[in-house]
Amino acid sequence: RPSFSLVEDTTLEPEEPPTKYQISQPEVYVAAPGESLEVRCLLKDAAVISWTKDGVHLGPNNRTVLIGEYLQIKGATPRDSGLYACTASRTVDSETWYFMVNVTDAISSGDDEDDTDGAEDFVSENSNNKRAPYWTNTEKMEKRLHAVPAANTVKFRCPAGGNPMPTMRWLKNGKEFKQEHRIGGYKVRNQHWSLIMESVVPSDKGNYTCVVENEYGSINHTYHLDVVERSPHRPILQAGLPANASTVVGGDVEFVCKVYSDAQPHIQWIKHVEKNGSKYGPDGLPYLKVLKHSGINSSNAEVLALFNVTEADAGEYICKVSNYIGQANQSAWLTVLPKQQAPGREKEITASPDYLE
């Protein structure tokens, strides 16, 4: 049975779809080598937070500091790149937030395929100095494990030199990598020493080896590709929103609810109200009133604006979001002060990440 009693009929179907929503993708944090990086785990009510990188448990070391909900990486190197996750363990369930870290001063997986910095990798040699193949830019090859969300573009590079100019070929799991081995094939940019696969799928997972050779020798380098599958999820609400607010009688106030959803979200703003002097119905459930919902007559449903507030407007405001998979809700409190008291924001609004579940 429902866990509340509606004060009025709020049947909202069939609804007009809201104008926009966001397909969730992991937030990408980019740092240049040598920089420090700090990331906050944006999950609420975490009793215990654990961290992983590319699926492996992450513990503190001389460069990695874990303090509460913060992860700090000091003096980042390309090896720090990968798919990170923080998991908030609660008494009844757990929730995971994923994000990508990309430590690079060059193009890497998921970036635009148009190289702008690759020409310098094509090294021309004095024709008299015969030389076996060698790597010209090992920094671009340090990140061996690439964990990439499905549908992204992946680029592997093996910048090399030699005389005569070496040739490059690619193996997948130790065997010749043929165009027909994947739908859509792949691109090889010889002048940039790169292999490009667009719209990766789980079957693309595996080891990719570049073999660079000339008549004086052969070198190789292996990358491991892991494709992180997305699956549909119920709405996710940004931590810390809506934020508690206070205003004076007669003032205006705004609550914001930031929604991430794979599917059309239906947003409702709900408030606890009284009926006949009681906050609860005969069944013991609280009386709730739908103040605003996404639909044909609704402007930006993620924002609830209250104008010329009175003391009666004080109380808890709930942002409830549903899609075909499930629901999520978060609430905030409005404090209405007498006119002589100045209002103040009670909770800082944090920056908005995307999520992958």
Epitope: P17, D93, A263, Q264
Partner: antibody, heavy 114, light 107 residues
């Protein structure tokens, strides 16, 4: 692993009611909607409604509003769909499905016949 | 209610063929469409969600595309085990409506 196990086949008289159960396991029952979908013999799929077990919120196809009642028992991780005022056209296989429609019950055949 | 018009209602193809099914919505539904495979006596099986995302474990020969009102489901190379009825479904607004189905047979 995720499983949805439905109650067995039923034969009902016109005008009576039927209550089909769907027991969930292998996931957090309160974190997903449970949908009910029916399929008449040789016909396509029709969505009846859904419930969010955590708070009991239910949503219905207008074609079934007033006749279908969807409930959930969190303590047993079981969802129920009751259909009243049965008629012969209600003869169908009734499926429950998890919120993402990735997992379905095996189906329950309800036959309405005098 | 949003009506989902699926075509063709049936089709016959040979193993190895490329098979395409279309679904048209009466209203724009962004990319909120799923595709299912159903074999006789079995529950439907989710193949594609959000128009183009293959569900976990679904072979890569199955793909989906489209946005707004027009959607396409493709089997790149038909296999004998793909013989089934395929349904599209919009999951944008309630009631979540299905297409009429496409029965796929082997020539």
């Amino acid at each position: 692993q995720v499983q949805l196990v439905q109650s067995g086949a039923e034969v009902k008289k016109p005008g009576s009611s039927v209550k089909v159960s769907c027991k969930a396991s292998g996931y957090i029952f309160t974190s997903y909607n449970v949908h009910w979908v029916r399929q008449a013999p040789g016909q396509g799929l029709e969505w009846i409604g859904s419930i969010y077990p955590d708070n009991g919120d239910s949503t219905y196809n207008q074609n079934y509003r007033g006749r279908a009642t969807i409930t959930a028992d969190k303590s047993t991780s079981t969802a129920y769909m009751e259909l009243s005022s049965l008629r012969s056209e209600d003869t169908a296989v009734y499926y429950c499905a998890r919120g993402d429609f990735a997992y379905w019950g095996q189906g329950t055949l309800v036959t309405v016949s005098s | 209610d949003i009506q989902m018009t699926q075509s063709p209602s049936s089709l016959s193809a040979s193993v190895g063929d490329r098979v395409t099914i279309t679904c048209k919505g009466s209203n724009g539904i962004s990319n909120d469409i799923a595709w299912y495979q159903q074999k006789p006596g079995k529950a439907p099986k989710l193949l594609i969600y959000s128009a183009s995302y293959r569900y976990s474990g679904v072979p890569s020969r199955f793909s989906g595309s489209g946005s707004g009102t027009d959607f396409t489901f493709t089997i790149s190379s038909l296999q004998p085990e793909d013989i089934a009825t395929y349904y599209c479904q919009q999951h944008s607004t309630t009631p979540y409506t299905f297409g009429q189905g496409t029965k796929l047979e082997i020539k």
